[in-house]
């Protein structure tokens, strides 16, 4: 055909997969009547009639485009729906009158690939390999046309480098016509690459312009020989008895060598292997002062059988020994003096203080507590606290009970108890003294004694309320070798109008408890035994 060589370049129409391509027939009125047009697709230089326009009416030809073509824009534009990669070809429209002319359109199809999927080589890479080893694989699925891949290390693009970096890319065509790209990065790595971040980037084009997608960043296991092993202790800082202490071996190689932790025997000066947990960590829980000493770590490379030894590390578990108070169980006469001395050993400087157990009041700062002109009230608990001020929480204490010789001291002198006749009464009476007193009652009933502490006793009596009992009341008498003392319980009948906070009735059986609400007080009186008494 004359003048075929000067054919103009086809008009470019760009569209994404799945969308609609609008193919506008660019014939001018002079070149042909648009009401009489044939549309062709050109594939491998073979043209196939796909659509014809007659008197402005369109008709698809049977074949692959039959269902996807329609006429728009008063017959000037052919719309192709559901574009696929296979639609990337030349379309042409041909006018029949006044003479045969044609207009060519190049359809370009695009599809963004999915997010690139990066997989690191799980086996890792030794640093001393002779040639590049597989670092990671990048896969970009379902893109069109084939995207470009760029590999990055620590944010910098990698280029092919002989014997150092090799990028091996391949692609497959899916049944959809889309491409899946696979790119393998091979490289020779060095020890410093153990923390290197690798990722791949896919570059692709869309009708809107150039785009890119990045994979996540990955690190690759890099294997390199151990040059140094060392010990690490947690927690850092001052350790104390009772702490959970972890001693672990660390090495600068990967994989780490087989570790063993040894402690120097202070007697033999020889290293003795300690038992570690499954992670190779020596856990001291609770840490004791005996754990103090010199520790070292041995790392054995099981491939080369090369053994490395760490620098020894001194571990100090600070402690306070058991606190000793002397005398341990002091007994003193009223009016006498007592010196309590507190002793303890520690790995650090100690501070001592004495507290009154009952009140928590600090009596003395220092190891020695001097008590003068002892009164009965001075009896009871004194606590020595030995602490290490530089290590919070490191302290030990010892309680000492000071016993002041004396006849029994009653918790109350007398008390009124509200009762009902025929009720079973539960009475209690408390006395203290040294030696510890015994308690007796002046009425028959079921009595039981409970020792409250070394100098204090509580007696409980269950007794039936009778008219005689109401008249006489109840007495409890506490006695020891130094004297005796009595408490009186007055029984008063409850009538319905009387409020009775001390008694409660349950299923017809009433129980009343008369027991001291406070520690012994000064209302009690002491009576020396009127005459010597023999008891078995």
């Amino acid at each position: 055909v004359p003048g075929e060589a000067e054919q103009p370049a086809p008009e470019l129409v760009e569209v994404e997969v799945g969308s609609t391509a609008l193919l506008k027939c660019g014939l001018s009125q002079s070149q042909g009547n648009l009401s009489h047009v044939d549309w062709f697709s050109v594939h491998k230089e073979k043209r196939t009639l796909i659509f014809r326009v007659r008197q402005g009416q369109g008709q698809s030809e049977p074949g692959e485009y039959e269902q996807r073509l329609s006429l728009q824009d008063r017959g000037a534009t052919l719309a192709l729906t559901q574009v696929t990669p296979q639609d990337e070809r030349i379309f042409l429209c041909q006018g029949k009158r006044p003479r045969s002319q044609e207009y060519r359109i190049q359809l370009r199809v695009y599809k963004a690939p999915e997010e690139p999927n990066i997989q690191v080589n799980p086996l890792g890479i030794p640093v001393n390999s002779k040639e590049p080893e597989e670092v990671a694989t990048c896969v970009g699925r379902n893109g069109y046309p084939i995207p470009q891949v760029i590999w990055y290390k620590n944010g910098r693009p990698l280029k092919e480098e002989k014997n150092r970096v090799h990028i091996q890319s391949s692609q497959t065509v899916e049944s959809s016509g889309l491409y899946t790209l696979q790119s393998i990065l091979k490289a020779q790595l060095v020890k410093e690459d153990k923390d290197a971040q690798f990722y791949c980037e896919l570059n692709y084009r869309l009708p809107s312009g150039n785009h890119m997608k990045e994979s996540r960043e990955v690190t690759v296991p890099v294997f390199y020989p151990t040059e140094k092993v060392w010990l690490e202790v947690e927690p850092v800082g001052m350790l104390k008895e009772g702490d959970r202490v972890e001693i672990r071996c660390l090495a600068d190689g990967n994989p780490p060598p087989h570790f063993s932790i040894s402690k120097q025997n202070p007697s033999t000066r020889e290293a003795e292997e300690e038992t570690t947990n499954d992670n190779g960590v020596l856990v001291l829980e609770p840490a004791r002062k005996e754990h103090s000493g010199r520790y070292e770590c041995q790392g054995l490379d099981l491939d080369t059988m090369i053994s490395l030894l760490s620098e020894p590390q001194e571990l100090l578990v600070n402690y306070v020994s058991d606190v000793r108070v002397s005398p341990a169980a002091p007994e003193r006469q009223e009016g006498s003096s007592l010196t309590l001395t507190c002793e303890a050993e520690s790995s650090q400087d100690l501070e001592f203080q004495w507290l009154r157990e009952e009140t928590g009041q600090v009596l003395e700062r220092g190891p020695v507590l001097q008590l003068h002109d002892l009164k009965r009230e001075a009896g009871g608990g004194y606590r020595c606290v030995a602490s290490v001020p530089s290590i919070p929480g490191l302290n030990r204490t010892q309680l000492v009970n000071v016993a002041i010789f004396g006849p029994p001291w009653m918790a109350f002198k007398e008390r009124k108890v509200w009762v009902k006749e025929n009720m079973v009464l539960n009475l209690s009476c408390e006395a203290s003294g040294h030696p510890r007193p015994t308690i007796s009652w002046n009425v028959n009933g079921t009595a039981s004694e409970q020792d409250q502490d070394p100098q204090r006793v509580l007696s409980t009596l269950n007794v039936l309320v009778t008219p005689e009992l109401l008249e006489t009341g109840v007495e409890c008498t506490a006695s020891n070798d130094l004297g005796k003392n009595t408490s009186i319980l007055f029984l008063e009948l409850v009538n319905l109008t009387t409020l009775t906070p001390d008694s409660n009735t349950t299923t017809g059986l009433s129980t009343s408890t008369a027991s001291p609400h406070t520690r012994a007080n000064s209302t009690s009186t002491e009576r020396k035994l009127p005459e010597p008494e023999s008891r078995g």
């Epitope: 341990a328 169980a329 007994e331 006469q333 309680l399 009970n401 016993a403 010789f405 040294h434 030696p435 510890r436 020792d451 409250q452 502490d453 070394p454 070798d481 130094l482 004297g483 020396k528 035994l529 010597p532 008494e533 023999s534 008891r535 078995g536």
Partner: antibody
Framework: QVQLVESGGGVVQPGRSLRLSCAAS????????IHWVRQAPGKGLEWVAR????????YYNEKFKGKFTLSVDNSKNTLYLQMNSLRAEDTAVYYC???????????WGAGTMVTVSS | DIQMTQSPSSLSASVGDRVTITCRAS??????????MHWYQQKPGKAPKLLIY???NLESGVPSRFSGSGSGTDFTLTISSLQPEDFATYYC?????????FGQGTKLEIK
């Protein structure tokens, strides 16, 4: 120094009586309890009785009640154990010992041997 | 009466050994933190000597190799490193109530 010294032991015929003495020195006699503990030859220790010199209160092992009697002479700081109706099984070393109100014996005399034999 | 049972009745050991003697009471001899159990050493022809009082307190002048422990009904006297002068008979005694009773004794002999 703190000391307890027993005396009065010896050989005595069955059914007879004997009085043992325990002299105390070096401490305030009336502030402590004095006990008698005996030990038969080759046997263990057996607590007999106690007295508190400050009040003269005595306690006895039930086994010796009515047979042994404790007394005290505060002016002499001396304790006595009167033993009646002695039998062969009363043959023992008799010790006096001191205690406080927790009843452990921190000071002991050297003991005096009583042999009941016909 | 509270019965005191010592074990063993006799024991052979060597100088430097660690020795443990136990004493079991037929009922508890402890009151709120205080255990009324005491230990004595007796050598032939001599009076007993107090070693440990109230279960764990070392009597003044007694070497620190002696220690006591326990509460309730079970108590232990330990000699950490036996010395030649420690070969003797050892007794436990309770003072929880009357009558006070002693264990039958443990004779510690040289092996």
């Amino acid at each position: 120094q703190v000391q307890l010294v027993e005396s009065g032991g010896g050989v005595v015929q069955p059914g007879r009586s004997l009085r043992l003495s325990c002299a105390a020195s070096g401490f305030t006699f009336s502030n402590y309890w004095i006990h008698w503990v005996r030990q038969a030859p080759g046997k263990g220790l057996e607590w007999v009785a106690r007295i508190y010199p400050g009040t003269d209160i005595t306690y006895y092992n039930e086994k010796f009640k009515g047979k042994f009697t404790l007394s005290v002479d505060n002016s002499k700081n001396t304790l006595y154990l009167q033993m009646n109706s002695l039998r062969a099984e009363d043959t023992a070393v008799y010790y006096c010992a001191r205690s406080g109100g927790y009843w452990y014996f921190d000071v002991w005399g050297a003991g005096t041997m009583v042999t009941v034999s016909s | 009466d509270i019965q005191m049972t010592q074990s063993p009745s006799s024991l052979s050991a060597s100088v430097g050994d660690r020795v443990t003697i136990t004493c079991r009471a037929s009922k508890s001899v402890s009151i709120s933190g205080y255990s009324y159990m005491h230990w004595y050493q007796q050598k032939p022809g001599k009076a007993p000597k107090l070693l440990i009082y109230l279960a764990s307190n070392l009597e003044s002048g007694v070497p620190s190799r002696f220690s006591g422990s326990g509460s309730g009904t079970d108590f232990t006297l330990t000699i950490s490193s036996l010395q030649p002068e420690d070969f003797a008979t050892y007794y436990c005694q309770h003072s929880r109530e009357l009558p006070y009773t002693f264990g039958q004794g443990t004779k510690l002999e040289i092996k």
